[in-house]
């Protein structure tokens, strides 16, 4: 069972948001299938996505075991219809991924404004704490559980009647801001990890929420 006419994978790319982590590659297979292996720098290789015709493999279950490790993956190419043979000694063509360190590299998912409440001239805006697939003692951890004080939120807010934006920052999931009485405001939040120096430092902005809609409450 040779590996003639199989093409090595290329363009191996990690796609990761809030630790949900997928390895993607090319090319779309023609008469071939793929198997992925993942390892930490000091660990053994573990096979995933056996003989798949897909060009992606979900490796979340492996990386969430330790999001602070650095991982390497490789994609093997086999002829279509390949069955593992104990007698086969020929190594199939494979390609290595770039290294991937989830804690430093996973993208921050789009946050959601959970609620806002106005009391007089103050508004309390609460950001929903997103769940991840990282576990501790069989309990899933939130983004805040994993990143702690490394994670902050930036609030953008503006009067519905104007375009001039103000900003506020918090290292919790709550903002308490001053507003003008009788004015409606709109809000959007962004998750930020200030310690990062790369493009994945910030999330995309949350959907805009405006006072006078159902997420808000007003009390005099």
């Amino acid at each position: 069972s040779g590996t003639t006419n199989t093409v090595a994978a290329y363009n191996l790319t990690w796609k990761s948001t809030n630790f949900k982590t997928i390895l993607e590659w090319e090319p779309k297979p023609i008469n071939q299938v793929y198997t992925v292996q993942i390892s930490t720098k000091s660990g053994d290789w573990k096979s995933k996505c056996f003989y798949t015709a897909d060009t992606e493999c979900d490796l979340t279950d492996e990386i969430v075991k330790d999001v602070k490790q650095t991982y390497l993956a490789r994609v093997f190419s086999y002829p279509a219809g390949h069955v593992e043979s104990t007698g086969s000694t020929e190594e199939p063509p494979y390609e290595n991924s770039p290294e991937f360190t989830p804690y430093l590299e996973t993208n921050l998912g789009q946050p959601t404004i959970q609620s806002f409440e106005q009391v007089g001239t103050k508004v309390n805006v609460t950001v929903q704490d997103e769940w991840t697939l990282v576990r501790r003692n069989d309990t899933f951890l939130s983004l805040r559980d994993v990143f702690g004080k490394d994670l902050i939120y930036t609030l953008y807010y503006w009067k519905s009647s104007s375009s001039g934006k103000k900003t506020a920052k918090t290292n919790t999931n709550e903002f308490l801001i001053d507003v003008d009485k009788g004015e409606n405001y709109c809000f959007s939040v962004q998750a930020v990890i200030p310690s990062r120096r790369t493009a994945n430092r910030k999330s995309t902005d949350s959907p805009v929420e405006c006072m006078g809609h159902e997420k808000g409450e007003s009390r005099e």
């Epitope: 602070k68 490790q69 650095t70 360190t101 804690y103 430093l104 609460t126 950001v127 704490d129 501790r136 951890l141 939130s142 983004l143 805040r144 559980d145 994993v146 990143f147 702690g148 004080k149 490394d150 994670l151 290292n171 919790t172 999931n173 709550e174 200030p194 310690s195 990062r196 120096r197 790369t198």
Partner: antibody, heavy 120, light 113 residues
């Protein structure tokens, strides 16, 4: 096994410069904050600042900002605390520590400490 | 800055008895996002570096004996040693691990009566 090994004791004169080190092993150095803590003779613990070696990002206590510099060389898994001009009041034990795995879960591992004595 | 104040400054307790150390923070250490209190307790024995005992106010670090427990929320926290052992003689520190700058309490010296 996680270990933080600090450089040896130093005796310096006021005005001199100094760099002490903290070498991490047994874990992924780039993804854990290294903390620096001062303990003056017979006194309590004071947090000085920290660094995330993967990005070089630092935080300083206002009490130490401008007087010390924290840096790291991730290629040799070593963090540094340095002074450009020492004072007698810098005489203390200096500890490095590593943050815990989870967010805000304390300083889980500590170095053995470096005793710095500044005297004319 | 968050100020951490411990009480008492020193404490003498008989072997086998309960020891209680209090810690008060000038601001709440409760994270609204995950309802965790970012308060940490350390033990430091003479001539040694500190040792992490408890994080998130009540979560014992791996390997720490279960006679050590932490409680409290917001601004008021307690470290309890249910049955004092000779090896527990040390200085105990609480720490704000909630927000920068991180700050320690002044320490509580625990001795045997």
């Amino acid at each position: 096994e996680v270990q933080l090994v600090q450089s040896g004791a130093e005796v310096k004169k006021p005005g001199e410069s100094l760099r002490i080190s903290c070498k991490g092993s047994g874990y992924t150095f780039i993804t854990y904050w290294i903390e620096w803590v001062r303990q003056m003779p017979g006194k309590g613990l004071e947090w000085m600042g920290d660094i995330l070696p993967g990005s070089g990002s630092t935080n300083y206590s206002p009490s130490f900002q401008g007087h010390v510099t924290i840096s790291a060389d991730k290629s040799i898994s070593t963090a540094y605390l340095q002074w450009s001009s020492l004072k007698a009041s810098d005489t203390a034990m200096y500890y490095c520590a590593r943050s815990g795995y989870y967010g805000n879960s304390g300083f889980a591992y500590w170095g053995q400490g470096t005793l710095v004595t500044v005297s004319s | 800055d968050i100020v951490m104040t411990q009480s008492p400054d020193s404490l003498a307790v008989s072997l086998g008895e309960r020891a209680t150390i209090n810690c008060k923070s000038s601001q709440s250490l409760l994270s609204s996002g995950n309802q965790k209190n970012y308060l940490t307790w350390y033990q430091q024995k003479p001539g040694q570096p500190p040792k992490l005992l408890i994080y998130w106010a009540s979560t014992r670090e791996s390997g720490v004996p279960d006679r050590f427990s932490g409680s409290g929320s917001g601004t008021d926290f307690t470290l309890t040693i249910s049955s004092l052992q000779a090896e527990d003689v040390a200085v105990y520190y609480c720490q704000n691990d909630y927000t920068y700058p991180l700050t320690f309490g002044q320490g509580t010296k625990l001795e045997i009566k």
